[in-house]
């Protein structure tokens, strides 16, 4: 009876020490997508609508505040896109790019993690125009860094949840 | 305040080419798209094409394709518009208009015509 | 290549009177609607833009509504001075216009 106890307290302990663990999936805010031709930093976004939710991670200013020291797997997905219903591209050669940036404000300091892109070109020709970025990675994340997003080109920016989105999870200590 | 001043009316032969000119002021002439839009006497508006002012980067309408040619100064701050191979079918009230999109904002050419020039009437006729 | 019709082609109401054109695209264009103001010898205006946008300067009697392939011009109170011929626009297509005349 006491191994089972034991076991059931040590179930309760993991179980709640998962549920202590930080993550984060935060969707683009479509209302609120900046304007710009050249790399602007996306700030608005939603963490409890949707798909979008947050745990033991802190959003704000448009950044995403690390509250736990931790090895983090961070990800984010950005698509492009343009209809000819929107009007026409004003050049056809495009640099389609995101950056994920790490920003630390005890030792002031900004770092870019990953980036992901491609230069495209977009004919006029065509009604529709896509494309997809994917960057993810594993990284040392310490108490009060923030983690941000730039892209190029804001105005071809899906605004939907399953095509714009970033996110982070922490997968273990740091010994 | 922005203007948009065309150059006067012209009266040409069929065969021959007129050049329209649109001198911008009030704006940053280089942030912006100039787009050419007729009237015939009796129709409707016609959409020819359009000139991003900042790179020169032209569109036009598949009916003007190959007798059309639009072309900016940027120091003049100016927009031309040269139609070729005219017919008597060209006879139409001429228009620039800019377009609301700023290039510094965002790359789409949004065909929203905020300020039109006051128009130039060309007439072609034997 | 989307086809834009108005109607009617021509109308004639009262001073005070509530006036709606109606523009109908061949398909879907979202929002990407815009209505001009013409009057002969005069540069164009531009009155809204992205189906319900007022452009800066235009009295608040005009408005617009609607999405997807069927658009509204609504002008509340027709004055003397909105005699003129009104296009819808989506893109490089042009409605055929509504000539509005007082009675």
């Known amino acids: 009876e006491k191994a089972m106890v034991d076991g059931s307290w040590l179930d309760l302990a993991k179980r709640s020490k998962l549920e202590a663990q930080p993550f984060a999936h935060l969707t683009i805010n479509a209302t609120d997508i900046p304007s710009g031709s050249h790399k602007v930093s996306l700030s608005s976004w939603y963490h409890d609508r949707g798909w979008a939710k947050i745990s033991n991670m802190t959003f704000s200013n448009g950044k995403l505040i690390v509250n736990q020291d931790g090895f983090y797997y961070l990800y984010a997905n950005i698509c492009f896109r343009h209809h000819e219903t929107s009007g026409d591209l004003a050049t056809e050669y495009l640099q389609l790019m995101v950056y994920v940036t790490k920003t630390s404000i005890k030792i002031p300091s900004s770092h870019t993690l990953m980036k992901g892109g491609s230069t495209k070109y977009w004919s006029g020709n065509s009604e529709f125009h896509f494309y997809s970025i994917n960057v993810g990675g594993f990284f040392k994340l310490r108490s009060g860094e923030e983690i941000s997003i730039e892209v190029s080109n804001p105005s071809l920016l899906d605004p939907d949840q399953d095509a714009t989105y970033f996110g982070a999870f922490k997968v273990r200590d740091i010994d | 305040q922005v203007q948009l001043v065309q150059s006067g009316a012209e009266v040409r032969k069929p065969g021959a080419s007129v050049k329209v000119s649109c001198k911008a002021s009030?704006?940053?002439?280089?942030?912006?798209?100039i787009h050419w839009v007729r009237q015939a006497p009796g129709q409707r508006l016609e959409w020819m094409g359009w000139?991003?002012?900042?790179?020169?980067?032209?569109k036009f309408s598949q009916k003007f394709q190959g007798r059309i040619t639009v072309t900016r100064d940027t120091a003049a701050s100016t927009a031309y518009m040269e139609l070729r191979s005219l017919r008597s079918e060209d006879t139409a009230v001429y228009y620039c208009?800019?377009?609301?999109?700023?290039?510094?904002?965002?790359?789409?050419?949004?065909?929203?015509?905020?300020?039109w020039g006051q128009g130039t009437l060309v007439t072609v006729s034997s | 290549e989307i086809v834009m019709t108005q109607s009617p082609s021509s109308l004639s109401a009262s001073v005070g009177d509530r006036v709606t054109i109606t523009c109908r695209a061949s398909?879907?264009?979202?929002?990407?609607l815009n209505w001009y103001q013409l009057k002969p010898g005069k540069a164009p205006r531009l009155l809204i833009y992205?189906?319900?946008s007022l452009q800066s300067g235009v009295p608040s009697r005009f408005s617009g509504s609607g999405s997807g392939a069927e658009f509204t011009l609504t002008i509340s109170s027709l004055q003397p001075e909105d005699i003129a011929t009104y296009y819808c626009?989506?893109?490089?297509?042009f409605g055929q216009g509504t000539k509005v005349e007082i009675k």
């Open positions: 208009a800019r377009d609301l999109s700023n290039m510094v904002r965002g790359i789409i050419i949004a065909y929203y015509f905020d300020y």
């Open positions: 009030g704006y940053d002439f280089s942030n912006y798209a």
């Open positions: 000139i991003n002012a900042g790179n020169g980067n032209t």
């Open positions: 398909q879907s264009i979202s929002r990407y």
């Open positions: 992205g189906a319900s």
């Open positions: 626009q989506h893109t490089r297509a």
